[in-house]
Interface confidence: medium
């Protein structure tokens, strides 16, 4: 019946206008939970982040005219008070309570206790089989307006089937006597009587039956599918794949930008062997002497062998230290150890293939051209 607007309205009127809907309220960062165990014991717990290292005290009364009593049975969490257990004075009473830090009230409220009922778990559950049906019975609780819910499944069912009655006498028909069935039972408070904030009881123990006889387990019960988990894994994998792809793409783009802004300058010492040693840098003589053959080689340690080269006319390349870099740590490690950054479009490990005036040269980042 929705949220029992009329019933709640009456409660608000009765409680002098203070009634927060739902199972908790908040004041000064205090959250409250009330559970009325089987109309016998009331448990009020609080979560006060602001007072996490404080022993808050709980004061209560069951009658609006009485003086407050202090809790004598506190619940502790990490050495500090976090709740109170009360014997219920009267089953339909309003609980007036105040949670205090010393003398300062941090949360004060009134609640109809029955709105927070949690019935006890079904006792003395029995099964009576007759052909393709079973009647499940248990001891009715000593108060009414409850629903007794039986859930059952066979190994071939993907989810639990459910049937409920307002007494603990539930007959389930259309069962297959050859199949093994698992059963469990719980008690729920009727929402139209107790409101929407009650708690179902704990489930009874699972019992398994086949051909009217109790079994230890329905061993062949398939584990329920976990679509949520596999979906999560799939989405995670796709996300990681996408991120890696984007990272590689961005690195490639950065490399292209760097090449565009800072063109590679060949090192004549490495690229033109004999140009300086034999021909004292005379390019025309060197070309004639080498009979128009360009040596496409780069010694592994060529740059380390040759000393720092002075530019002949114009130094187009800035020093590497000044070059902007946006590399991931792996790339930085590779470069520091002398390895080259392997990108798909690079044809040779030694450097870039560059053509000048019909001649092909292999260059790396430290090469330059004398014009």
């Amino acid at each position: 019946m929705g949220r029992l607007v009329l019933l709640w309205g009456a409660a608000v009127f009765l409680l002098g206008g203070w009634m927060a809907l739902g199972q908790g309220g908040a004041a000064e960062g205090v959250q409250i939970q009330i559970i009325y165990f089987n109309l016998e014991t009331v448990q009020v717990t609080w979560n006060a982040s602001k007072y996490s290292r404080t022993n808050l005290t709980f004061h209560y009364r069951f009658n609006g005219d009485e003086a407050y009593d202090q809790c004598t049975n506190y619940l502790l969490q990490e050495g500090h008070t976090s709740g109170c257990l009360l014997d219920a004075e009267q089953r339909d009473d309003i609980l007036y309570f105040s949670i205090r830090n010393g003398t300062h009230p941090v949360f004060t409220a009134s609640r109809w206790m029955v709105y927070y009922l949690k019935p006890s778990s079904p006792k003395h559950v029995r099964f009576s089989w007759h052909q393709d049906a079973v009647t499940v019975t248990c001891s009715d609780l000593s108060y009414g307006d409850l629903l007794y819910e039986v859930q059952y499944r066979s190994p071939f069912d993907t989810e639990w089937q459910s049937k409920q009655e307002n007494t603990c006498n539930v007959t389930i028909e259309g069962l297959d006597a050859e199949k093994c069935y698992s059963f469990w039972v719980r008690v729920k408070a009727m929402e139209d009587v107790y409101g929407p904030d009650t708690y179902p009881s704990d489930w009874s123990e699972v019992t398994c039956w086949q051909r009217g006889e109790i079994r230890d387990a329905c061993a062949e019960t398939p584990t329920p599918p976990k679509p949520k988990l596999s979906k999560f894994i799939l989405i995670s994998s796709l996300a990681i794949l996408l991120m890696v792809s984007l990272l590689l793409l961005s690195l490639w783009k950065l490399w292209r930008v760097k090449k565009f802004l800072i063109p590679s300058v060949p090192d004549p010492k490495s690229i033109f062997p004999g140009l300086f040693e034999i021909h004292q840098g005379n390019f025309q003589e060197w070309i004639t002497d080498t009979q128009n053959v360009a040596h496409l080689h780069k010694m592994a340690g060529a740059e380390q062998e040759s000393g720092p080269e002075e530019p002949l006319v114009v130094q187009l390349a800035k020093t590497e230290a000044e070059s902007p870099r946006m590399l991931d740590p792996q790339t930085e490690e590779k470069e520091a150890s002398g390895g080259s950054l392997q990108l798909p479009h690079q044809p040779l490990q030694g450097g870039d293939v560059v053509t000048i005036g019909g001649f092909t040269f292999v260059m790396n980042d430290r090469s330059y051209v004398a014009l």
Epitope: M1, R91, D92, D145, V193
Partner: antibody, heavy 118, light 107 residues
């Protein structure tokens, strides 16, 4: 102060249906209470017939369950009793009463005598 | 169903007497028991609830005690206005049930 007032015919023929209404005043029928019917045959004790919550949820005495219907009309702030297939044994003073949730009866109507006779 | 048995069914007493009425439940009802007083031609009136709690406006000469299956209503000093029939009622479990009643009459 809650007041309850029964009304209905004082004479019902055997095998007929006894119909009574209880008007609630001085309080809301939507409150956290159950609205009950109790009867008392002449010179005998009290017998609980059944009760209803404003939502329509009912509880009946098993000894009368097959013949009893209790209903509520929130718009008129009243609830009703119907007892079918009556016999002389159903002759009694019928009281409507308010019962606090899972509790005792705290307010009663003054009662109305219903005689089953041809 | 729970049966409620009251004893005695009739009790003769004089003004000023101490009177006790017993109510027995066929199974435990903890303390979910009420006592009512009824005078001829009138509706029952609540005296005691939850076995021992005195209803507002009821004279303190009335008291209730007991738990489980045995309960007692006591009138410490009987007054002329107290001559009536008294009923116990359990409300621990459906169906609600009344005792057969005890009539307190003038000796």
């Amino acid at each position: 102060q809650v007041q309850l007032q029964e009304s209905g015919p004082g004479l019902v023929k055997p095998s007929g249906t006894l119909s009574l209404t209880c008007a609630v005043s001085g309080g809301s029928i939507n409150s956290n209470n159950w609205w009950s019917w109790v009867r008392q045959p002449p010179g005998k004790g009290l017998e609980w017939i059944g009760d209803i919550y404003h939502s329509g949820s009912t509880n009946y005495n098993p000894s009368l369950k097959s013949r009893v219907t209790i209903s509520v009309d929130k718009s008129k702030s009243q609830f009703s009793l119907k007892l079918s297939s009556v016999t002389a044994a159903d002759t009694a003073v019928y009281y409507c009463a308010r019962r606090r949730w899972l509790q005792h009866f705290d307010f009663w109507g003054q009662g109305t005598l219903v005689t089953v006779s041809s | 169903d729970i049966q409620m048995t009251q004893s005695p069914s009739t009790l003769s007493a004089s003004v000023g007497d101490r009177v006790t009425i017993t109510c027995r439940a066929s199974q435990s009802i903890t303390n979910w028991l009420a006592w009512y007083q009824q005078k001829p031609g009138k509706a029952p009136k609540l005296l005691i609830y939850k076995a021992s709690s005195l209803e507002s406006g009821v004279p303190s000469r009335f008291s209730g005690s007991g738990s489980g299956t045995e309960f007692t209503l006591a009138i410490s000093s009987l007054q002329p206005d107290d001559f009536a029939t008294y009923y116990c009622q359990q409300y621990n479990i459906y169906p609600l049930a009344f005792g057969g009643g005890t009539k307190v009459e003038i000796k």
